[in-house]
């Protein structure tokens, strides 16, 4: 008789990351009988939704359904039909929607409402759309990378199954950079977390974790750029802004109304004698770095030590995974290697920013100009944020690992979010099955 393969006893989950600049859909899969084991959930698909973030649909909510169609149809294809009704779908919106809610709760509700209506028409188990807090975003990112790195597993190994593994149970810190916010999350060394808002307590797999987290709203790379432009145009003598964060020869016209559209630039808002201004790139890393530093208020700190803007930050501890835009930007700049020192990164950034715009366009012909033009700013911003914002040093730089994926799953908050909502991270260590295969090499 012919051997028939037994049907795979697997489960699926879908998380949509509705970020400020775009939406991505992630499909996760795991063996049904190993739900509580650590490291069994893995990503089988990522689908990037074509178009901007959902907060940009505030004046065209009727287009949201079409916007989500391609990726939801992709999910329909990837997940077996027999599993559709049991597959939970979650949508988490981050800082782009936090900013919209600050402007108008009613408009944010309208966008979320239409998103929910659209997603509820698919045959999955839709579990709602919500704006997650910055604290959640930080916490779930931390859970994701440590889950994928095997840090919650009690089984010690003499061999390494994943890159970056330091072969101990000490967790990695998480550094997440988005378009509108950035998060820093880690377990401090025997340090009291002086501000309760930044303290999280977890019990995972039988172990307690006291975690520090903070989300800096308006300090994602896109909103930081808007802030910098709004700050610099205040002192411009006319409608020309000579900007060191853009390549020499680069020119772009900016509408003042667009500049002041975001709550992030409110503190710099002033009446200008023009409706538009032109950015003219001069490509100088050092001057760009200095301009960025003016966004960080380090003159005030009500705690033993701060990051910036009076926000408590304990002394950095251990290794850190830097993901999302930290990774994408550094990957583009070819600066993700473990061997590249902070001094080398700075040197490379100086050279890159000084390259003429025409040369850059030729060298990276396949890259959209909108993105290409901002890598000098973004790279400089990452260095400024990590060194002056979070107080990494040339020495501690080597503890930052720029991570895109771990074991095939994207680093980011979505996996941690799903693990939490599906109750797949037990507080206590599950009873190990007899003769667990992990006993053997």
């Amino acid at each position: 008789t012919q051997n028939k393969a037994l049907p795979e006893n697997v489960k699926y989950g879908i998380v949509l990351d509705a970020g400020s600049s775009h939406t991505s859909l992630y499909i996760y899969k795991w063996p049904a009988e190993k739900e509580n084991d650590t490291g069994v959930v893995h990503q089988v698909e990522e689908c990037r939704v074509k178009g901007p973030g959902i907060s940009k649909f505030v004046q065209k909510v009727n287009e949201i359904g079409i916007y989500l169609t391609d990726c939801m149809e992709r999910a329909r294809e990837v997940i077996p039909r027999s599993q559709h009704q049991e597959t939970p779908v979650y949508l988490g919106a981050t800082a782009g929607m936090r900013l919209l809610r600050m402007e108008s709760e009613e408009l944010a509700d309208r966008v979320l409402d239409v998103v929910e209506r659209s997603l509820s028409n698919y045959p999955f188990d839709f579990q709602g759309a919500r704006i997650i807090t910055g604290q959640e975003e930080g916490a779930y990112g931390w859970i994701t990378i440590n889950y994928l790195l095997g840090k919650f597993s009690q089984k010690t190994r003499w061999f390494s199954i994943v890159p970056y593994e330091t072969n101990n149970q000490e967790t990695f810190g998480a550094l997440d950079l988005g378009g509108a916010s950035t998060q820093v999350t880690f377990v401090p060394q025997n340090q009291t977390i002086e501000s309760p808002d930044n303290a999280l307590q977890f019990r995972l797999y039988g172990k307690d974790y006291n975690v520090y987290t903070h989300s800096f709203l308006c300090y994602g790379k896109d909103q930081a750029l808007w802030q910098k432009l709004a700050k610099d145009i205040q002192v411009a003598s006319n409608e020309i802004l000579r900007d060191p964060c853009f390549h020499p020869g680069y020119k772009k016209v900016v509408n003042v109304s667009d500049l002041y559209k975001t709550p992030c630039t409110k503190r710099f808002e002033m009446t200008l004698p023009f409706q538009q201004f032109e950015i003219q790139g001069i490509g100088n890393y050092q001057q760009c770095h200095q301009s960025i530093l003016e966004l960080f208020n380090t003159s005030y700190c009500p705690y033993s030590q701060c990051a910036f803007n009076g926000i408590f930050l304990p002394p950095l501890q251990g290794d850190f995974g830097a993901f999302s835009a930290f990774y994408f930007v550094m990957k583009f700049l070819n600066l993700t290697s473990e061997k590249v020192s902070q001094e080398k990164v700075t040197e490379m950034m100086k050279k890159f920013c000084a390259q003429p715009w025409e040369e850059i366009k030729t060298s990276y012909a396949g890259v959209k100009e909108k993105y290409l033009s901002e890598y000098c700013f973004s790279g400089t911003y990452i260095l400024s944020l990590l060194l002056q914002g979070y107080h990494f040093t040339a020495d501690s730089w080597e503890h930052i690992h720029f991570i895109g994926k771990i074991q095939g799953s994207d680093a980011g908050w979505t996996l941690g979010y799903m693990l939490n909502l599906t109750n797949m991270i037990p507080a206590e260590q599950p009873l190990s099955t007899p003769l667990s295969h992990s006993t053997y090499v």
């Epitope: 909510v61 509700d109 239409v114 209506r117 509820s120 839709f126």
Partner: antibody
């Protein structure tokens, strides 16, 4: 004072379709979502689907997907619910109801008087 | 979908007495729960939304409480016009779902 005025009772044959209307009079219509809820004789309430007339965005309960179509005409402030492939179990009073607001405000603060649809051969 | 379960199915109460109706959700709906009253031959009428907020024109004898999965509607002193069927409805997630109803009848 806004009122939701529904079309009259209908008797239909199994396999046919019915289209019930719900007209808003005396107030704004477009910016509120309208849901359709049915109630079989002696039974409870069952949500069928909803539409935001302003955007033409409809969503449906999985049970009715493919069999129900909800539309709206902003110019006449009227919402419609069409149910096809009728069977005897579809005999019920069909209500239109206004949702109080967006997102987490999807409770019904205004109801039509109901339209009795009887499916019988 | 979220299953809403009401208990008891029927509640016999004397006028002037207190009536306590329960509603349980199969998963957390936070405080996104509404209560309706329906009399024979009439459409339902909104009493409570957001688990505890009284709708416009609803007498103070009606009060709602609870959050997550367990909810209660209390009628502090039943009047003759309160004898009816009461439904709970979750307004947290699509599809919107109703409980099976509790009939409050005269004892």
């Amino acid at each position: 004072q806004v009122q939701l005025v529904q079309s009259g009772a209908e008797v239909k044959k199994p396999g046919s379709s019915v289209k019930v209307s719900c007209k808003a009079s005396g107030g704004t219509f477009a910016s509120y979502a309208i849901s359709w809820v049915r109630q079989a004789p002696g039974q409870g309430l069952e949500w069928m689907g909803s539409i935001i007339p302003e955007f033409g965005i409809a969503n449906y309960a999985q049970k009715f997907q493919g069999r129900v179509t909800i539309t709206a005409d902003e110019s006449t402030s009227t919402a419609y619910m069409e149910l096809s492939s009728l069977r005897s179990e579809d005999t019920a009073v069909y209500y239109c109801a206004r949702e109080a607001g967006y997102y987490r405000y999807r409770y019904f603060d205004l109801w039509g008087r109901g339209t009795l649809v009887t499916v019988s051969s | 979908e979220i299953v809403m379960t009401q208990s008891p199915a029927t509640l016999s109460v004397s006028p002037g007495e207190r009536a306590t109706l329960s509603c349980r959700a199969s998963q957390s709906v936070s405080s996104n729960l509404a209560w309706y009253q329906q009399k024979p031959g009439q459409a339902p009428r909104l009493l409570i939304y957001g688990a505890s907020t009284r709708a416009t024109g609803i007498p103070a004898r009606f009060s709602g409480s609870g959050s997550g999965t367990e909810f209660t509607l209390t009628i502090s002193s039943l009047q003759s016009e309160d004898f009816a069927v009461y439904y709970c409805q979750q307004h947290a997630l699509w599809p919107l779902t109703f409980g099976g109803g509790t009939k409050v009848e005269i004892k």
